[in-house]
Each structure stands twice: as structure tokens, then as C-alpha cells.
């Protein structure tokens, strides 16, 4: 009778094992082991027992002990079971961004690993088991479907193998794949809203706003704003599930014409885009040309208005005849024209919009000086000791300087409140002077005062003065 010990062995792949072959007869003709494995016999006393070291055990094997005894031949098998953890445990690659609501198939592939009967494949989200199946096939493949939800954003999915050798007195061997981090997103089907001027003038700045609602996660959304080839640099403001991107756009003469304004929102592996056309135009203000901005009264003045070749102008409210970019008017400058504004309004149609530009020039008419009865009365009669304000207004441009002098030496305080004394009486020569010339006007001031009649105790001086036509003024004595 042949026996083997141990009859069952579980060992790691590539490992070694001692196998003892025994026989029941004392003097066996033959005692040995049959195995393809490398073997080494360990010498022991006696003839009925042999110990072999079997090494580099790579796969399950059934070495067989045999003996030839006088009563016959017999054999005994030992069962070597090799265990090893899988060489590859991995999740099939997936795009990191997944839209919410999509069915996501997780596929785990396991290569190697034994004994397969003890090998299980587990699919996990975080630590939560999604599916557990025995490893079947080579490679073994386990799949599960997940409906992508918002709250899956940032979740880690992984695959784990469990080689459970605890019933054989060993431990539980686990192998885990590299995690797959899921990024979930919501990008609405509606395109972004783009608000911008339809027309934009050369050398000006416009504001472009691009916005979109219903995004998740909004902070991950990328916004690209561009006008033609010009990338804009927006300032982005985020809401809970919305954003608003605001950018300033400057345009130059090179941009003139129709340009495409684009706003693209990229989230995950999807994008939404809105296109709009912006017409960039050049429209300088019309030019108002006066033959001379400052002219003397009576001068012929030509006022011209010139604008963009495609514009239509009106000069002081009168449309050009024929309707077009030029208008002019002729006038003879009068004092009433001083300070008169000549306004040219030009209208240009750009992409269906009417653009208006204005330019105003003022005409200065030099005239005067003037002194007339209405504004500088020639005669004043005032009671003595009353408060009066002599008024005399000189007209002209530039405004004349006015001085009223009696005898070239006594000024009349024009526009000042004065106490009327006999001193004030007399004829004043009012002179208005400016760069345009000089005019004079005589102004007489009469002072009403009761005459001294003389009488007892009187000096009689008044009689002498009256007779000689001499008047006494408080400060001056002179002949009338």
C-alpha cells in the first residue's frame, strides 16, 4: 500500500513543498514520485519512506507516489493547488465627464488569479458595492450600469478582486484597480444668450454679455468670447447654476465691416455656441466750416456742412438739397448773428440702424460800439439828495468799455447807487470804446433843488451868482 503526505496542499505560485511518499512493506523493490516539477530527494534512514522537495510550482499539479512491494504495485496522489492574485485589475477607460441622466457602463477586467473558485470581482462606488460576481473567463469581465446623477459628481468608482483562502487556513487577498473619478455635468440644450451692440463705431468700446442658466457644475464651465479673430477677456460672474460673462470690445479701422461675435460655453465634453453679427462702422462727426469764425458786421459768411459720403445732412434743420452728405448756407453777418450756432446733423444707416452725429460751430460777429437813447438816455433829472443809479448800456462785440466824463475829468458812476448832489449836475460825454471803434453820446444830468431866495440875514451871494450866471458846486467853482 502506497501513501502520500500531505494529500492536499495549497501554495503560492512558484512556491515549494515537501512531499513524503511511504509504503507499507519493509523492503520495497521501488519507491518514488512521478511529477513534471523539479524535485530533490531528501535522504532519510530506512527503505519504506522518501521525502521530496518539489519546487517552482507554477500551476495546479497532482504528483503521484508509487511503490513496488512483493505483494504488488500501488500509487497515491497528492493534490497541489497553486494560488495567485490577479496580474491586472482595471476598469475600462471612460471619459471623465459624464452628462447627468446618462447610463454609464462600468466594465472591470481581471487577468490571472487562482484558484478561480475562490476569486470574486466587486464593482464599487466609493465603499459601496455595486456588483459582486465570481471571476469567470480569461480575462474575467464584470459589468454594471449606473444612471449618472448630480450627486455622483466627484465620486470614485473602482474594481476589487477578492481571493478568499480563509477556508484553506490562509487569508483574504484583495487587489484594487486605479479609481475612476466621475465628473458629472449638466449643459442645457439652449444656446447661451448673447447681448451686444448690433453696430459698433470704430475707435469706441462696446460691452458684450454672454450668459447661460441651468449649468452644473457652473464653476467648471469655460466661456470663450471672440469678435472675429479677437479673443475677448471677459469678467465672469457665477450664480448657483448660471454665469454671466461681460467683456469690453474695442474696435479699430482694421475691424471695419461685418464681424462674427461668438460665445462658446464648454462643459465636460460638450459645448454650446451662439453666433451674432456685429457691424463695425466708421462715421466721423460732420464738419461745420465757417469761412471765418469771427467776422465784422456786414461780412458775407459761408457755412458749409460736410459729412460721411453715405450720410445725409441737415444744416440748422434744413436738409441738404439734394439729400446728401453736403449742405451750405450764405448769410450777411449782423449783430443778431453774434453767438449764433450753426448745427449740422448727419444721419448714416448702418445695418438697418440710423446713426446720428452732430457738430456745432458758433459765429462771432464783431460790431459796435453802440450807444442809443433806449439804453443810454440823454437826459436825467433827479431831485437833490435822492438815491439814483445812472444807467447807460453800451452794446457791441467785444463788449465796449464805457466811461462818462464831465469836462474830461468828472466820472459819472454808471450802474452805481449815488446820492444826488449839485456836483452831479452837468453834461457828460459818454464814450464807448472797443477794438471795433469808438462812439460818443452826450448825457445831461439835471439836479432839482430849491433856490435860495435871500432875505434878512442873507448874504445876498445868490443874487450875485444868479446875475453873473455863476453856479456854486460843493467841490468846484467854475463858470457856466
Amino acid at each position: 500500500q502506497t501513501s502520500v503526505s500531505p494529500s492536499k496542499v495549497i501554495l503560492p505560485r512558484g512556491g515549494s513543498v515537501l512531499v513524503t511518499c511511504s509504503t507499507s512493506c519493509d523492503q520495497p523493490k521501488l519507491l518514488g514520485i512521478e511529477t513534471p516539477l523539479p524535485k530533490k530527494e531528501l535522504l532519510l534512514p530506512g527503505n519504506n519512506r522518501k521525502v521530496y522537495e518539489l519546487s517552482n510550482v507554477q500551476e495546479d499539479s497532482q504528483p503521484m507516489c508509487y511503490s513496488n512491494c512483493p505483494d504488488g504495485q500501488s500509487t497515491a496522489k497528492t493534490f497541489l493547488t497553486v494560488y495567485w492574485t490577479p496580474e491586472r485589475v482595471e476598469l475600462a477607460p471612460l471619459p471623465s465627464w459624464q452628462p447627468v441622466g446618462k447610463n454609464l457602463t462600468l466594465r472591470c477586467q481581471v487577468e490571472g488569479g487562482a484558484p478561480r473558485a475562490n476569486l470574486t470581482v466587486v464593482l464599487l462606488r466609493g465603499e459601496k458595492e455595486l456588483k459582486r460576481e465570481p471571476a469567470v473567463g480569461e480575462p474575467a469581465e464584470v459589468t454594471t450600469t449606473v444612471l449618472v446623477r448630480r450627486d455622483h459628481h466627484g465620486a470614485n468608482f473602482s474594481c476589487r478582486t477578492e481571493l478568499d483562502l480563509r477556508p484553506q487556513g490562509l487569508e483574504l487577498f484583495e487587489n484594487t484597480s486605479a479609481p475612476y473619478q466621475l465628473q458629472t455635468f449638466v449643459l442645457p440644450a439652449t444656446p447661451p444668450q448673447l447681448v451686444s451692440p448690433r453696430v459698433l463705431e470704430v475707435d469706441t468700446q462696446g460691452t458684450v454679455v454672454c450668459s447661460l442658466d441651468g449649468l452644473f457644475p457652473v464653476s467648471e464651465a469655460q466661456v470663450h468670447l471672440a469678435l472675429g479673430d479677437q479673443r475677448l477677456n471677459p469678467t465672469v460672474t457665477y450664480g448657483n447654476d448660471s454665469f454671466s460673462a461681460k467683456a469690453s470690445v474695442s474696435v479699430t479701422a482694421e475691424d471695419e465691416g461685418t464681424q462674427r461675435l461668438t460665445c462658446a460655453v464648454i462643459l465636460g465634453n460638450q459645448s454650446q455656441e451662439t453666433l451674432q453679427t456685429v457691424t463695425i462702422y466708421s462715421f466721423p462727426a460732420p464738419n461745420v466750416i465757417l469761412t471765418k469764425p469771427e467776422v465784422s458786421e456786414g461780412t458775407e459768411v459761408t457755412v458749409k456742412c460736410e459729412a460721411h459720403p453715405r450720410a445725409k445732412v441737415t444744416l440748422n434743420g434744413v436738409p441738404a438739397q439734394p439729400l446728401g452728405p453736403r449742405a451750405q448756407l450764405l448769410l450777411k453777418a449782423t449783430p443778431e448773428d453774434n453767438g449764433r450756432s450753426f448745427s449740422c446733423s448727419a444721419t448714416l444707416e448702418v445695418a438697418g440702424q440710423l446713426i446720428h452725429k452732430n457738430q456745432t460751430r458758433e459765429l462771432r460777429v464783431l460790431y459796435g460800439p453802440r450807444l442809443d437813447e433806449r439804453d443810454c438816455p440823454g437826459n436825467w433829472t433827479w431831485p437833490e439828495n435822492s438815491q439814483q443809479t445812472p444807467m447807460c448800456q453800451a452794446w457791441g462785440n467785444p463788449l465796449p468799455e464805457l466811461k462818462c466824463l464831465k469836462d474830461g475829468t468828472f466820472p459819472l458812476p454808471i450802474g452805481e447807487s449815488v446820492t444826488v448832489t449839485r456836483d452831479l449836475e452837468g453834461t457828460y460825454l459818454c464814450r464807448a470804446r472797443s477794438t471795433q471803434g469808438e462812439v460818443t453820446r452826450k448825457v445831461t444830468v439835471n439836479v432839482l433843488s430849491p433856490r435860495y431866495e435871500g432875505g434878512s440875514g442873507g448874504s445876498g451871494l445868490n443874487d450875485i451868482f444868479e446875475a453873473q450866471k455863476i453856479e456854486w458846486h460843493e467841490e468846484n467853482l467854475y463858470f457856466q
Epitope: L405, D407, G408, T409, F410, P413, E416, R431, N476
Partner: antibody
Amino acid sequence: QSVEESGGGLVKPGGTLTLTCTVSGFSLSSHAMGWVRQAPGKGLEYIGIIGSSDRTYYASWAKGRFTISKTSTTVDLKITSPTTEDTATYFCVRDPYDSYDDGYRLWGPGTLVTVSS
Amino acid sequence: AYDMTQTPASVEVAVGGTVTIKCQASQSIYRYLSWYQKKPGQRPKFLIYDASKLASGVPSRFEGSGSGTEFTLTISGAQSDDAATYYCQQAYSSGSIDNAFGGGTEVVVK
């Protein structure tokens, strides 16, 4: 347009001296003319004025001692019985009371009168 | 009488400094006031008329102000050439007055 004084020099106290102001480039019929003096180390002192109508006006201290008169092109200042106090530079000035700016107010260069025995 | 009182009699100023000269009339002369600059051996130079109007060719650093009885001449950013005696003159009344001119203010520029 210019004004120039003449007639200054040495005069004995109690004598008589007449200074003449000759004008050119304007008419005396439309301008007032005045006389101002400055004694050595003293300030400007107003003497009097003759108006465009030939009327005369004097400082209170000058009445009776000074007489201003004019012809078509000259204005005279007569000093009666001068004293050493009257030693000064005498200036003739056009329109001293007119406040127009004619580029500058016309003053003569002045003439020095020395009263000494 | 329209007597003119000028203060101070003398003032010292550094180049670039500011000088203020005051002139007071004994009764209102409205705005009829002129200012003169007088240097030894030279005729008076007309600076300001009607209290605040600058005569032709006068630098803008000279400024006149006031009306009625109180008047001021201000020299801002004084220059060495501004060293002179300055006089105010009332141009309102020519009769029965002691002097149409103020007593003068000597300006020394250091």
C-alpha cells in the same frame, strides 16, 4: 502821441515860473490835462487839472499859488511866488481821471524845478 | 475831500513772494482807482485802472481789487524788477482835494 514838459530850472523864491507841456498826436479839445509833482524823497502830489472845456480844478493847497491854462497844443503851469517847498520834478499827464487803457496813460518825462536863493 | 491813505509805507519781500498794498479812500470813489509804479528818475508807469483792470503790457502777477473805500494791489511771485514805489490814485473827484494820490509804498525785493 506824446507829452513833454519844459521850462524847469533854478528860480528864486518869490519869483514867477511858467512850465509848459507840449502835446503831439492828439487834440487838447477832447482830453483833460493834469499836473503832478514829486519833491525829492517825497511822494507824488496832485496839483490840478484843466478839463477839455478849459475849466480848471486844483488841489486845495494849490489854489491861488498855481494857475493852469492851455492853448491848442500846450498846457501851462504858472507858479506864483515859489518857495523852497516847491522844489520838485513836475510832470504833465494826459487824462489822469479817464479810466480807458490807451496802451499807457501819457506822462511826460518830467522837468526839475529848483527854488533857491 | 477824497483823501487817500496807503499802507504800509514800506514792505520787504523775497523774490517769488507776495506783496499786498492797501489803499483807503475817505469816502466812496466807487471803482475809480488807479495804481502806478514809480522808479527813481523815471516817469510813473500806469499799472491798473478801474480798481482791477490791467493796463496793456502789465504782467498778470499784478492784481487789483476792491471798490467803494477799500482797495488792494497784490503782487504775486515778486521779481527783482518790481522793486519800486507804488501809488494809488483816486480818479473820481478833481476838486477840493488835498491829494489824489496815496502816500506811496516802497517795495524792496530781496
